[in-house]
Structures are given as structure tokens and as C-alpha cells.
């Protein structure tokens, strides 16, 4: 075993190339200079090293950089990134979006690993916020990324970043997440005109309050039923029949098919039957004519 620690004559690596795939693990350890490896990391990815050989190369880098790898090395890790542990990654200081992209590319098509999660966490914390370019990059690789963040984490997303969000990025979000994202979207898109604004804000409307829905009803937006069904029940309940009719436009006929489902069901129960009848859709379950409607929430507020 002792003689294996010295590099055999003529085997000292002058550069990182294909010849190294024929080296045994101990030869790689003895014959590859860590500083050479660090400067030629970009070549490693093109060479079909075994997992065992990659372990040796990682070990050499770990010895050279015990406090964590520099970004010049990290950016070129390639498949060696898959050998890193979250503990290794916590030592890194990744500031370049190009570095982040390069490492995400290695994991592309796979579920997010703990390593990638740690990398993203380090990167975002280093930047101080989830800026537009970062969000753009992350959602390109992980369409469900935004919806995997808690509402508390989403609260630190600046409104300017919302421009990077595509409708499909919100597909798996729950109502509490949309409650946080909607005001940011409203702020981000505030300078757009009516129809363009609605196209952009539509995916976020699951977090919209009643007053914003009332305002939209005045703008001939013709909201589709799929969007309407995702609205907050508490936001829909105070809307009048006339407001819902304006909000949905020609799509109002779809209410009949959804009359047993929230929020339509609960909204119907709050409307006067006479008002519902004006829609001509045969919606049933409204408050019969002549009955007094007590606003219990107002009564509680007064007492």
C-alpha cells in the first residue's frame, strides 16, 4: 500500500484529459495536482469518469479548498455537482446567475434534490431577495418553484419580479399563496391598460378582494368560469347579481353548471331569488322575495 502513494514514473498528469480514465483511483489521487484540476474543471465534464473516479477528484478539491470552492471552480463542476452534499454547498458563495444556471442544468429533468435546494437557498439569500432574473431562471427549470414556497417566503418577493411569472407557474399554488402574490401583481401591473392588465392579473385573481372584483366588473373583462371558480369565496359573496353578470359577460351562462360548487353555491345563497331570476339561467336557492336579509357581520361589528 505504501508504494501506491507515490505517482508512478511518467504518469504525472500534465493536463486533465481522456487518458485519466485509465488511471486507478490511487493513481488519480497521486498523479493529479489539485491546482491543475481546479484550473481545468471545465474539461472534467467531457471525460467519462466513473463515479469512483469522481469521488477522488472531489476529494482533491476538498483538500485544496477546505473553506469552500471558489466560484470559478463551482461554475465548471458539471456532473461533479451531483457528488456534493448540502454541507459542502453551504460553504459556497455563489453570486453569478450563470453559475446557478450551469448547476441547475446538471439536474435538469429531475426532481429538485436537497443539493439544488441548498444551492438556491444560498444564492437567493446572497442576493437578498428573489429578483426577476433569478425567478425567471428558477421557474424555467422548476415550474412549480413559486408554489413550493410558503406565503412567508413569498412575502419577500419584490413586485418587479412578478413580471417573470407565467400562468403555469401558479398552477399548484394554494389560496394563501395567492393572497400574498396578488397585491404584488396588482402593483407590478398597475400602469397597464384595462384589457392588457386583465390578461396579466388573471392568474393571480385567486387572491383578489371584493373591491377589486367590483372594479373589474366595470371594465368589460369577460372573466371565464375557470377563473371565477378560483376566486376567494369571501370575496365573491358580497358581489351583486349585476356585478357578477358584468364580470363574467357572455360566460355568465356557465354559472348554471357550477351552481353546486363553491364559490357559486355560497354566492347564490346570499342573493335575492328575484335578482337571480333576472339572469334567466334557472339558478335556485336564493333568498325568497319578501324575506328580510340581516347582515350579521355588520350586527357583530356594531355590538
Amino acid at each position: 500500500e505504501v508504494e501506491k502513494t507515490a505517482c508512478p514514473s511518467g504518469k504525472k498528469a500534465r493536463e486533465i484529459d481522456e487518458s485519466l480514465i485509465f488511471y486507478k483511483k490511487w493513481e488519480l489521487e497521486a498523479c493529479v495536482d489539485a491546482a491543475l484540476l481546479a484550473t481545468q474543471m471545465d474539461r472534467v465534464n467531457a471525460i467519462p469518469f466513473t463515479y469512483e473516479q469522481l469521488d477522488v477528484l472531489k476529494h482533491k478539491l476538498d483538500e485544496l479548498y477546505p473553506q469552500g470552492y471558489p466560484e470559478s471552480v463551482i461554475q465548471h463542476l458539471g456532473y461533479l455537482f451531483l457528488k456534493m452534499s448540502p454541507e459542502d454547498i453551504r460553504k459556497w458563495n455563489v453570486t453569478s446567475l450563470e453559475t446557478l444556471k450551469a448547476l441547475l442544468e446538471v439536474n435538469k429533468g429531475h426532481e429538485m434534490s436537497p443539493q439544488v435546494a441548498t444551492l438556491i437557498d444560498r444564492f437567493v439569500k446572497g442576493r437578498g431577495q428573489l429578483d426577476k432574473d433569478t425567478l425567471d431562471t428558477l421557474t424555467a427549470f422548476y415550474p412549480g418553484y413559486l408554489c413550493s414556497l410558503s406565503p412567508e417566503e413569498l412575502s419577500s418577493v419584490p413586485p418587479s419580479s412578478i413580471w417573470a411569472v407565467r400562468p403555469q407557474d401558479l398552477d399548484t399554488c394554494d389560496p394563501r399563496q395567492l393572497d400574498v402574490l396578488y397585491p404584488k401583481a396588482r402593483l407590478a401591473f398597475q400602469n397597464m391598460n384595462g384589457s392588457e392588465y386583465f390578461v396579466k392579473i388573471q392568474s393571480f385573481l385567486g387572491g383578489a378582494p371584493t373591491e377589486d372584483l367590483k372594479a373589474l366588473s366595470q371594465q368589460n373583462v369577460s372573466m371565464d368560469l375557470a377563473t371565477f371558480m378560483k376566486l376567494r369565496t369571501d370575496a365573491v359573496l358580497p358581489l351583486t347579481v349585476a356585478e357578477v353578470q358584468k364580470l363574467l359577460g357572455p360566460h355568465v351562462e356557465g354559472l348554471k353548471a357550477e351552481e353546486r360548487h363553491r364559490p357559486v353555491r355560497d354566492w347564490i345563497l346570499r342573493q335575492r331569488q328575484d335578482d337571480l331570476d333576472t339572469l334567466g339561467l334557472g339558478l335556485q336557492g336564493g333568498i325568497p322575495n319578501g324575506y328580510l336579509v340581516l347582515d350579521l357581520s355588520m350586527q357583530e361589528a356594531l355590538s
Epitope: M112, Y142, G144, E152
Partner: nanobody, 115 residues
Framework: EVQVVESGGGLVQAGGSLRLSCVAS????????MRWYRQAPGKQREWVAS???????HYEDFVKGRFTISRDDAKNTLYLQMDSLKPEDTAVYYC?????????WGQGTQVTVSS
């Protein structure tokens, strides 16, 4: 292969309790937003509660104070403790794993609350 399997449903009297479990595999559980949804007969599926990887928990208003969601990342398991059950809680309860890549659903577990 990703698997999401719920268990713990059953028949219980109004005012009673049940604890649902959801065991997931095939993805990194610790980075997923884990959620419970439910679907009553003839109704749409509705969100119940969420447990996020940073430890934050969120509930729909109609279950707040009665249901408690929790997760055990070491066991890849999500739980829903349901107390003070009402007949209107009768539904199929679904576990949803929202990973950064996509969402995975279980087959559901039936909860029936009799009056």
C-alpha cells in the same frame, strides 16, 4: 417512481376525531409544499391546509381551530389531525405534494361523519 398514499379515513360520529396520514416517496419530501385537499360528493375539490418546508402552516377558514396539519420530513409523512368533526366534513381527503417541478396527488381516503 413517485408514490403518494393516504390512510386513516373512516366512519366517525359528529364531534369525533380522525388522524389522516400521507406517505410519499420518489422525490425529495423536504423541499415539497405538502397539502391536504378534500372533495365532497358532487362538489369540487377544495384546499384544506398546507405545511411548507420552512415550517409554516396554513389553513382554510372552515377548518381553522379544528384541524391540525403537520409533517415529518424524516419519515416522508404528512398528517392531518381532525377534531370536532362535522357532517359537512364528509369527503374524500387527498394528499398533494407540490414539488418545485410539479404536483403529485394521492388516490384519497374517505372520511364519513355521521350525525
Amino acid at each position: 417512481e413517485v408514490q403518494v398514499v393516504e390512510s386513516g379515513g373512516g366512519l366517525v360520529q359528529a364531534g369525533g376525531s380522525l388522524r389522516l396520514s400521507c406517505v410519499a416517496s420518489g422525490f425529495t419530501f423536504s423541499v415539497a409544499a405538502m397539502r391536504w385537499y378534500r372533495q365532497a360528493p358532487g362538489k369540487q375539490r377544495e384546499w384544506v391546509a398546507s405545511a411548507f418546508s420552512d415550517g409554516n402552516l396554513h389553513y382554510e377558514d372552515f377548518v381553522k381551530g379544528r384541524f391540525t396539519i403537520s409533517r415529518d420530513d424524516a419519515k416522508n409523512t404528512l398528517y392531518l389531525q381532525m377534531d370536532s368533526l362535522k357532517p359537512e366534513d364528509t369527503a374524500v381527503y387527498y394528499c398533494n405534494a407540490g414539488t418545485p417541478s410539479r404536483a403529485y396527488w394521492g388516490q384519497g381516503t374517505q372520511v364519513t361523519v355521521s350525525s
